[in-house]
């Protein structure tokens, strides 16, 4: 098993990248002198206790920043949040920490990230751009849930 996080860069089909702005991840068109975040990801080591056919369960963080993506309900609405957390602390926990886990599915060059805590809810960006990343149940409508993930070695 790999027990160090892998690093990657992400953009959506409109070539927008993820940028950290005031502790919030937003998707913006790539420009010069811009610093897109580098993603840190690591597979859950308790994969045998999670559903088999939804994708690879991963923890998603921001490389070098001790910030991880998590899903939590605000009222009745699952929301995407950044929490100060060491991704390896999550990896080493005795059980899957579902609020921080995403099923990573790949189809060709496209990746989707589905919340383990809230099945059917996916990381998404508004088609308008310049907006925060969100969770959505509505695939392929006003929001983009397909991303290109390029691993950095």
């Amino acid at each position: 098993k790999i027990d160090t996080p892998q690093r990657g860069s992400i953009q959506d089909i409109n070539h927008r990248v993820w940028v950290l702005q005031d502790q919030t991840l937003i998707a913006v068109p790539r420009k010069d002198r811009m610093s897109p975040v580098t993603i840190a990801l690591i597979s859950c080591r308790h994969v045998e206790t999670l559903e088999k056919d939804r994708g690879n369960p991963i923890y998603l963080g921001l490389n070098g920043l001790n910030l991880c993506l998590m899903c939590a309900k605000v009222g009745d609405q699952p929301t995407l949040q950044l929490k100060e957390k060491d991704i390896m602390d999550l990896y080493n926990q005795p059980e899957p920490v579902k609020s921080f886990l995403f099923y990573h599915s790949q189809s060709g060059r496209n990746s989707t990230f589905e919340s383990v805590a809230f099945p059917g809810w996916f990381i998404a960006v508004s088609s308008e751009g310049g907006c925060p990343l969100i969770l959505t149940q509505e695939l392929g409508k006003a929001n983009t849930t397909d991303f290109g993930l390029t691993m950095l070695f």
Partner: antibody, heavy 121, light 109 residues
Amino acid sequence: EVQLQQSGAELVEPGASVKLSCTASGFNIKDTYINWVKQRPEQGLEWIGRIDPANGYTRYAPKFQGKATITSDTSSNTAYLQLSSLTSEDAAVYSCSTLNYYGSSFFFDFWGQGTTLTVSS
Amino acid sequence: QAVVTQESALTTSPGETVTLTCRSSTGAVTTSNYANWVQEKPDHLFTGLIGGTNNRAPGVPARFSGSLIGDKAALTITGAQTEDEAIYFCALWYSNHWVFGGGTKLTVL
């Protein structure tokens, strides 16, 4: 208010099976891991295993593989512990507990009141 | 399977500091054992106190703290109160299962 309500005391004959229940109120069992532990007088606690009610996946302590079966029914918000081929060694109090993640750790936080199992002919 | 050992009984006085320990038969207890501490009062009333070696569960009084002391996990009660009289169990994680100790009966006289 969060509560785990366990089924009542059982008197069962050796060789038989028994199914104990643990019904949650105040939260959805799909949002936690439900654990079962065994307690005999002067013998401490023994962890039997756990279930993730969201998907039905279980883990067991090596000693209880084949002896215990943990299941759940999310429609009734209930977890079950079935014990088979009962002997006097299985006579004990059995308790259910939630295992929840807060902030940075998992905790055995909420507990049922225990079910006393007596094995006797 | 690993064996987890605790003091069978300890006695303290109100206001005193007392430390309960938890030893593993497999070697030193480390943060990878995610030590949990649970309190049992009469009639099988259990309360989770500590998780992940040193993190207090929500609502647990600050006088309870968890740590590693030498090769053991420890629960320290700073300024014990009469209501802390109970049995205290530790649980250690071993790769894919938990093992509980035999419990420490704490008397506060």
